[in-house]
């Protein structure tokens, strides 16, 4: 019951988080005009990952897309990439986790398969959350750097007769949405990973009975099909996570994920 609740909660938290990451990515207010210690202008500037906008006091708002790809700063491109990777991983994670939910029955899917899918989606959510947090943090760092550079310009560039209003940008709402959303996705992912441990089938107390056939030595364990799937107890007397090292007959017996390109 606790496992189902943890898995369900993890799914919901991740869902909210990914929705937040999508919202943050689409938002125009990644950076907003700094109003502190600046002349009060009748124009308010703000910028997003995809376009920059100007809102006049009269209410008129005009947004212009960044139609160039090569002319944009590398950092902005990197942030875009991180956010998109985060969204894609999160979306795949959500899809996987829907089928992994213990409360949803799909055919005769074993708990072990669900456990694996839960772990997979959990890892995807964690990486998705980290991508969003990284993207937002990179952008925030870029803003801080530019803010202090423009502040320096503001006080050094006033030697002439004509003063220019230096528009400085500070953190926009999208940054906070992104941080919170990334954090939620991360938490959801962790919860899914925790739920995976509870979903994994317990080791039985029965001793495995070994039947020695004339050919290969194969151990049969109670549990039917589970023994031959990748999700059950390991049939060979070696660690599951062996770093990819396999015996010759094992490579022949079990198709590897690398066999299909």
């Amino acid at each position: 019951m606790a496992v189902t609740a943890c898995q369900g909660l993890g799914f919901v938290v991740s869902l909210i988080g990914i929705a937040g990451i999508i919202a943050a990515t689409c938002m125009d207010q990644w950076s907003t005009q700094d109003l502190y210690n600046n002349p009060v202008t009748a124009v308010f500037n703000y910028q997003g990952l995809w376009r920059s906008c100007v809102r006049e006091s009269s209410g008129f708002t005009e947004c212009r897309g960044y139609f160039t790809l090569l002319g944009l700063p590398a950092m902005l491109q990197a942030v875009r990439a991180l956010m998109i990777v985060g969204i894609v991983l999160g979306a795949i994670g959500l899809l996987v986790s829907i089928f992994a939910l213990k409360c949803i029955r799909i055919g005769s899917m074993e708990d072990s398969a669900k456990a694996n899918m839960t772990l997979t989606s959990g890892i995807m959510f964690i990486v998705s959350g980290l991508c969003a947090i990284a993207g937002v943090s990179v952008f925030a760092n870029m803003l801080v750097t530019n803010f202090w550079m423009s502040t320096a310009n503001m006080y050094t560039g006033m030697g002439g007769m004509v003063q220019t209003v230096q528009t400085r940008y500070t953190f926009g709402a999208a940054l906070f949405v992104g941080w919170v959303a990334g954090g939620l996705t991360l938490i959801g992912g962790v919860m899914m990973c925790i739920a995976c441990r509870g979903l994994a089938p317990e080791e039985t107390n029965y001793k495995a009975v070994s039947y020695h056939a004339s050919g290969h030595s194969v151990a049969y364990k109670p549990g039917g099909f589970k023994a031959s799937t990748g999700f059950g107890s390991n049939t060979k007397n070696k660690k599951i996570y062996d770093g990819g090292a396999r015996t010759e007959d094992e490579v022949q017996s079990y198709p590897s994920k690398h066999d299909y390109v």
């Epitope: 002349p39 009748a42 124009v43 100007v54 009269s58 209410g59 003063q163």
Partner: antibody
């Protein structure tokens, strides 16, 4: 048809108060701002202040302490409250609609004359 | 606050002539966000309220004849009337619509020579 009509002007003694009204028709004050501009006899235009659609106001720095702009959206009317009037406040007072582009004024009222004299 | 300086204060001209009015601001009126200059030009005839001619320094208001054009950027702006018509003799004002307070220039009076 957008129309702005100012009223409330007249002769007032120095130190007294006066409230000017700008009745707006054809548009909603919830969507547009209104500027107040004055013009002393034979002089140029002087911006007094503005009340934006959201209700926030901005003023000419020298007038901020004495003048207050407010509005009543239900009556579609903007007010200019002038306190501690001085002789130099004698002018024709205009209200103008804040145009959607460039924060400029595209429609103006005919003006109301305020004379501060003892 | 921004000081708007218009020159010359008065111009005596004849109909059909080309005229250029100057307006200078003490601070740049160029907004980096949209690369637009927040300067407006108005025309005022005696006994009348001002009339909007040009906003964003160069965008002509819909009802304004094509002979009126605005140009300039940053701190230096001009209003050009390509061929003066009798109805164009009036006072022209420029206004800063960027930084509060939204100050006006002193005006340039166009009078008939």
């Amino acid at each position: 048809q957008v129309q702005l009509v100012e009223s409330g002007g007249g002769v007032v003694q120095p130190g007294r108060s006066l409230r000017l009204s700008c009745a707006v028709s054809g548009i909603s004050l919830t969507r547009y701002g209104v500027h107040w501009v004055r013009q002393a006899p034979g002089k140029g235009l002087e911006w007094v202040g503005v009340i934006w659609a959201g209700g926030n106001t901005n003023y000419e720095s020298a007038l901020m302490s004495r003048f207050t702009i407010s509005k009543d959206n239900s009556k579609n009317t903007v007010y200019l409250q002038m306190n501690s009037l001085r002789a130099e406040d004698t002018a024709m007072y205009y209200c103008g609609r804040a145009y959607g582009k460039g924060n400029s004024m595209d429609y103006w009222g005919q003006g109301t004359l305020v004379t501060v004299s003892s | 606050e921004i000081v708007m300086t218009q020159s010359p204060p008065t111009l005596s001209l004849s109909p059909g002539e080309r005229v250029t009015l100057s307006c200078k601001s003490s601070q740049s009126l160029l907004n980096s966000g949209n690369q637009k200059n927040y300067l407006t030009w108005y025309q005022q005839k005696p006994g009348q309220a001002p009339r909007l001619l040009i906003y964003w320094a160069s965008t002509r208001e819909s009802s304004i004849p094509a002979r009126f054009s605005g140009s300039g950027s940053g701190t230096d702006f001009t209003l050009t009337i390509s061929s003066l018509q009798p109805e164009d003799f009036a006072v022209y004002y420029c206004q800063n619509n960027y930084i509060y307070p939204l100050t006006f220039g002193g005006g340039t009076k166009l009078e008939l020579k």
